[in-house]
């Protein structure tokens, strides 16, 4: 339906409140490195004019597109060219090309300072003094950090972020308070960051079919009783509301969002039993609650599929006439009945069927060609499976922190290239998949493990595509979606690797390792494990393991000395030479 | 821990009916589809028939069609398969099996198998 004035729309549907916090977040998603006090100008600017648009929507300038508006207020920025740099060059285009062109220069690792939590007192102080500045401050520093947080989420979060420091500022023992709700806000941002970042990637690399297929199979494991025309349309709005997100239309994105909240609320009966509760909470948590509902039960009774899409001799005249609805039915009908696959495995056996029907509907005897196709899912189902249990059982044997390490080494060894920041953090994250889905039964151990294996992968992919080092990542990145784990599960040791030279400097270590938190230092030793890696590629597991205990001693030792710094540098260099004796180096 | 245990097996004339049984114990059977698979002597193991966890679907192999009958009993936690005119090719260890989700009744979507019971057919 066509708005005079689409500002004037999306202000009366959001409301002056969400307006002007999606506004903001997209500026920041833009513009990572401007000040806050620019970025808030600029949404004040806008806000103004919107409310102009809003009593005469016939106003000078209310007709032009969001993108147009927008782009036109991000140009006014003086120092565009001075921080930016090539950016600038995208305000001498025109739209659409300039929306695309803001989008391409969206930065997944900005060069920004480490957000350092102040003191309680002074959080609530801050916070009392100005609640309004202080909450834009929130959304403006995780919107930048994160240029593809999903904006309606990010309200959600900023909404529990009131509500603790509220909460919170006035109990007896504020730290006690606030502190662990301000880390389960920190951890869930970030992993709710790295799922949307792995939704923009999928829309934006792979296309819209590869998301709706993503769609389709999620949405029917969590909702088997939908039929399939119900399931069909809600992956076609969430496509929708998803697109605008990925592509910088938040107040879209967030407007189509409430609407599908709203109509999925109106028809639960006939989409899922399990959605009650979510449809009686406010709208942020509502739609944050659907976004996580459990998967409904299954019907009592489902056949079995052969008879539709092996036996029928009608296979290939339906998959002819319209292959990708088929190709989706075929989707629905499995996903509804493996809640225990994950989606990139159900989107696995989908390719694989139609990669046989392609072949065998073009065969003298098709049915013949395609009798056995179920067969040919066996080995796709026990690969991950067989994965999961070796790396369960590895998790449970050393813990989190040595299995982080094992995984260091070994995906270090597949790609050395790779920077050791990066190297460091996807391996930490890789290795959490232990305490996140090991302790699952069986039946829910593979969409957990496998599908957040897909999103840190992705992490590896974005960060790797800024600046290109290794071939072999591109191309497990570029090649196919759903075989991104696979193929880097698949990669030996890279034997084409020429050993990074020596660095004293690297295993160089001071006092201050002393005072950082556990976390902190484990970084640090596992920073220097991905180092001794590159210097030496085919170190065993053995020399590593000896190399690193002396080195937790060394830590251990001179933390406890009188003088520190004299302890480290003195053992240090003893250190060294005796890990370059031992490494043969 | 969940056992499945067939029984019925044994020898049979070609042409003759055998009725296999298997009881489950240990999981909540109204919750799982039932399968047998077969395995004749240097053969494959291969899928016969399975059925839906309310009863209400079956699936047969080409080969059983119109001669084997699978059934459950969700009160006494029991699958049966009734076998009519059987054949010589038909000799092999029939093995019952549970699958807690099922999509195509392969022998990879199951998840507990019984040890199985041997039905021999003679010409």
């Known amino acids: 339906d066509a708005h005079k004035s689409e500002v004037a729309h999306r202000f009366k549907d959001l409301g002056e409140e969400n307006f002007k916090a999606l506004v903001l977040i997209a500026f920041a998603q833009y513009l990572q490195q401007c000040p806050f006090e620019d970025h808030v100008k600029l949404v004040n600017e806008v806000t103004e004019f919107a409310k102009t648009c809003v009593a005469d929507e016939s106003a000078e300038n209310c007709d032009k597109s969001l993108h147009t508006l927008f782009g036109d207020k991000l140009c006014t920025v003086a120092t565009l060219r001075e921080t930016y740099g090539e950016m600038a060059d995208c305000c001498a285009k025109q739209e659409p090309e300039r929306n695309e062109c803001f989008l391409q220069h969206k930065d997944d690792n900005p060069n920004l300072p480490r957000l350092v939590r102040p003191e309680v007192d002074v959080m609530c102080t801050a916070f009392h003094d100005n609640e309004e500045t202080f909450l834009k401050k929130y959304l403006y520093e995780i919107a930048r950090r994160h240029p593809y947080f999903y904006a309606p989420e990010l309200l959600f979060f900023a909404k529990r972020y009131k509500a603790a420091f509220t909460e919170c500022c006035q109990a007896a023992d504020k730290a006690a308070c606030l502190l662990p709700k301000l880390d389960e806000l920190r951890d869930e941002g970030k992993a709710s960051s790295a799922k949307q970042r792995l939704k923009c990637a999928s829309l934006q690399k792979f296309g819209e079919r590869a998301f709706k297929a993503w769609a389709v199979a999620r949405l029917s494991q969590r909702f088997p009783k939908a039929e399939f025309a119900e399931v069909s349309k809600l992956v076609t709005d969430l496509t929708k509301v998803h697109t605008e997100c990925c592509h910088g239309d938040l107040l879209e994105c967030a407007d189509d969002r409430a609407d599908l909240a709203k109509y999925i609320c109106e028809n639960q009966d006939s989409i899922s039993s399990k959605l009650k509760e979510c449809c009686e909470k406010p709208l942020l948590e509502k739609s944050h609650c659907i976004a996580e509902v459990e998967n409904d039960e299954m019907p009592a009774d489902l056949p079995s599929l052969a008879a539709d899409f092996v036996e029928s001799k009608d296979v290939c005249k339906n998959y002819a006439e319209a292959k990708d609805v088929f190709l989706g039915m075929f989707l629905y009908e499995y996903a509804r009945r493996h809640p225990d696959y994950s989606v990139v495995l159900l989107l696995r056996l989908a390719k694989t069927y139609e990669t046989t029907l392609e072949k065998c509907c073009a065969a003298a005897d098709p049915h013949e060609c395609y009798a056995k196709v179920f067969d040919e899912f066996k080995p796709l189902v026990e690969e991950p499976q067989n994965l999961i249990k070796q790396n369960c059982e590895l998790f449970e044997q050393l813990g989190e922190y040595k299995f982080q390490n094992a995984l260091l080494v070994r995906y270090t060894k597949k790609v050395p290239q790779v920077s050791t920041p990066t190297l460091v953090e996807v391996s930490r994250n890789l290795g959490k998949v232990g305490s996140k889905c090991c302790k699952h039964p069986e039946a829910k151990r593979m969409p957990c493990a496998e599908d957040y294996l897909s999103v840190v992968l992705n992490q590896l992919c974005v960060l790797h595509e800024k600046t290109p080092v290794s071939d072999r990542v591109t191309k497990c990145c570029t090649e196919s979606l759903v075989n991104r784990r696979p193929c880097f599960s698949a990669l030996e040791v890279d034997e084409t690797y020429v050993p990074k030279e020596f660095n004293a400097e690297t295993f160089t270590f001071h006092a201050d390792i002393c005072t950082l938190s556990e976390k902190e230092r484990q970084i640090k030793k596992q920073t220097a494990l991905v180092e001794l890696v590159k210097h030496k590629p085919k170190a065993t597991k053995e020399q590593l393991k000896a190399v690193m205990d002396d080195f937790a001693a060394f830590v251990e030792k001179c933390c406890k000395a009188d003088d520190k710094e004299t302890c480290f540098a003195e053992e240090g260099k003893k250190l060294v030479a005796a890990s370059q004796a031992a490494l043969g180096l | 821990e969940v056992q499945l245990v067939e029984s019925g097996g044994g020898v049979v004339q070609a042409g003759g009916s055998l009725r296999l049984s298997c009881a489950a114990s240990?999981?909540?059977?109204?919750?799982?589809?039932m399968g047998w698979f077969r395995q004749a002597p240097g053969k494959e193991r291969e899928r016969v028939v399975s059925?839906?966890?309310?009863?209400?679907?079956?699936y047969y192999a080409d080969s059983v069609k119109g001669r084997f009958t699978i059934s459950r009993d969700n009160a006494e936690n029991t699958v049966y398969l009734q076998m009519n005119s059987l054949k010589p090719e038909d000799t092999a260890l029939y093995y019952c099996?549970?699958?807690?989700?099922?999509?195509?009744?392969?022998?990879?979507?199951?998840?507990?198998w019984g040890q199985g019971t041997l039905v021999k057919v003679s010409s």
């Open positions: 059925i839906s966890r309310g009863g209400g679907y079956t």
């Open positions: 240990g999981l909540t059977f109204s919750s799982y589809a």
């Open positions: 099996a549970a699958a807690r989700y099922w999509a195509t009744g392969s022998e990879y979507e199951f998840d507990y």
